[in-house]
């Protein structure tokens, strides 16, 4: 009878993570008597995967009927494959003895595991930035195999080109991670904008994974201020408004100062939203000019999103004859000693 040969017909097998891998092995003879064992890797550090003779291998089942001696098929199925199972598997025939001695090994079957990348996670800068500034976004995805992967960046559907990508580790590994950093220039219109990281991999069957970041979490659009004096509502009263326009986010505190003294502080609440996602707000101050003998300097001071305050002032002139009031015009002082100032917002 010819000497036993161990045949592993498949040089390589590729399996998706979570599936079962079938590793084929047949022998050409019933002798010598002794067990078949499967190992991952070669040499002294090889890992025992299955031993026909003994042991508990819960993930391994024999493919063929192993209770018949004439069976020469020692193929195994390994369930619930993970990237950690990747490697070269050897079917090895042993000769019975004390100890069992290796008689012949198959040529090996390389098992590669196709593992999907995790959902990309996009993160932006820790602090908000203002338009015209360049900010960095990072995208990370892990656990994929094989190593080949494609990553693209988009802003509102437009592909970005200013980014750097690394896949780790550089050498052989059971699975890989990708890390990419993209630079994005902010504009005042970016409140509604999205930055998208798109990952394409063989395991995704042409349906890439996407991670998004809303620029609303990154951008700060500082407000523009305009202080105007409205026509007289009633005898001796002047309505001064502070228009706070095109700001984001909403967190805003406004303080009215009269000749440098705090008159009233309020927090933006009932704001109106613009199409571009920024907000407008108006605060008004009703000044009883009869309470003033001298000119009044009214200042609208705005602290937006914890930033240093910006302000706009308006000189309210107290003159001898009342007239139609326009922006930055004076109102007649009636001579009243009362200092009545009323305020509101909208």
């Amino acid at each position: 009878e010819e000497e036993l040969q161990v045949i592993q017909p498949d040089k390589s097998v590729s399996v998706a993570a979570g599936e079962s891998a079938i590793l084929h092995c047949t022998v050409t003879s019933l002798i010598p008597v002794g067990p078949i064992q499967w190992f991952r890797g070669a040499g002294p550090a090889r890992e025992l995967i299955y031993n026909q003779k003994e042991g508990h291998f819960p993930r391994v089942t024999t493919v063929s009927e192993s209770t018949k001696r004439e069976n020469m098929d020692f193929s195994i199925s390994i369930s619930n494959i993970t990237p950690a199972d990747a490697g070269t598997y050897y079917c090895v025939k042993f000769r019975k003895g004390s100890p069992d001695t290796e008689f012949k090994s198959g040529a090996g079957t390389e098992l590669s595991v196709r593992a999907k990348p995790s959902a990309p996670v996009v993160s932006g800068p820790a602090a908000r930035a203002t338009p015209q500034h360049t900010v960095s976004f990072t995208c990370e995805s892990h656990g994929f195999s094989p190593r080949d992967i494609t990553l693209k960046w988009f802003k509102n559907g437009n592909e970005l080109s200013d980014f750097q990508t690394n896949v780790d580790p550089v050498g052989e590994s059971v699975s890989y991670s990708i890390h990419s950093t993209a630079k994005v220039v902010l504009t005042r219109e970016d409140v509604h904008s999205q930055v998208i990281c798109e990952v394409a991999h063989v395991t995704l069957q042409g349906d890439p994974l996407r991670g998004t970041a809303n620029l609303s979490e990154t951008i700060r659009v500082p407000p523009t201020l305009e202080v105007t004096q409205q026509p007289v509502r009633a005898e001796n009263q002047v309505n001064v408004t502070c228009q706070v326009r095109k700001f984001y986010p909403q967190r805003l505190q406004l303080t009215w100062l009269e000749n440098g003294n705090v008159s009233r502080t309020e927090t933006a609440s009932t704001v109106t939203e613009n199409k571009d996602g920024t907000y407008n707000w108006m605060s008004w101050l009703l000044v009883n000019v009869s309470a003033h003998r001298d000119d009044v300097k009214l200042t609208c001071q705005v602290e937006h999103d914890g930033q240093p305050a910006v302000s706009k002032s308006h000189d309210l002139k107290v003159s001898a004859h009342p007239k139609e009031q326009g922006s930055n015009t004076a109102a007649e002082n009636t001579g009243s000693n009362e200092r009545n100032i009323y305020g509101g917002s909208g």
């Epitope: 019933l30 002798i31 008597v33 078949i36 003994e54 001696r69 069976n71 019975k96 004390s98």
Partner: antibody, heavy 118, light 107 residues
């Protein structure tokens, strides 16, 4: 059903010969190592002989040169030709199948009695 | 030849008892050790192979252990049908050899 049935035992005089047969059913005998084991009255078990799948044969020291193990694949049968029998060969002879990969005994026949006496 | 020595040669026990029989080989036999049960007038029955693996249909109250030269057969809770003679056997190399047997009797 996997089964082994021995036959051919009986009374024989010292120096005589006997041929034991073992008919296998439910499996292909040629695919297994096959054995003969005996048990003298009131004694323990003693392995006698074996034949491997390649036709290689093995014997315990006391029967070497006197006993011959063989098989006939067409009849799915195992044989033990016993010559120059001695009183010490008196025993129940069992036909036994070796295990799938390690030759551990798994299937036993019911046995056949061989008595060597004058 | 490899000598197999069983102990004890006989053992008295009661129904429900847990009993252990030992078998020692004169040289290392790896774990190529089998256990058999034989009742009077009957053919032996295979219980255990490779020291600890149960043959198909053998109840789990039987268990085997050991490797190298020292082996044990344990019956966890004796039932009336378990009173019989038990043999160990090495099958690592020819000639295969048996222990002399342990007769398990009802106390």
């Amino acid at each position: 059903e996997v089964q082994l049935v021995e036959s051919g035992g009986g009374l024989v005089q010292p120096g005589g010969s006997l041929r034991l047969s073992c008919a296998a059913s439910g499996f292909t005998l040629s695919s297994y190592d096959m054995h003969w084991v005996r048990q003298a009255p009131g004694k323990g078990l003693e392995w006698v002989s074996a034949i491997g799948t390649a036709g290689d044969t093995y014997y315990t020291g006391s029967v070497k040169g006197r006993f011959t193990i063989s098989r006939e694949n067409a009849k799915n049968s195992l044989y033990l030709q016993m010559n120059s029998l001695r009183a010490a060969d008196t025993a129940v002879y069992y036909c036994v199948r070796g295990g799938v990969w390690d030759d551990a005994f798994d299937i036993w026949g019911q046995g056949t009695m061989v008595t060597v006496s004058s | 030849d490899i000598q197999m020595t069983q102990s004890p040669s006989s053992l008295s026990a009661s129904v429900g008892d847990r009993v252990t029989i030992t078998c020692r080989a004169s040289q290392d036999i790896n774990n190529y050790l089998a256990w058999f049960q034989q009742k009077p007038g009957k053919a032996p029955k295979s219980l255990i192979y490779t020291a600890s693996s149960l043959h198909s249909g053998v109840p789990s109250k039987f268990s085997g252990s050991g490797s190298g030269t020292d082996f044990t057969l344990t019956i966890s809770s004796l039932q009336p049908e378990d009173f019989a003679t038990y043999y160990c056997q090495q099958y690592v190399s020819y000639p295969y050899t048996f222990g002399q047997g342990t007769k398990l009797e009802i106390k």
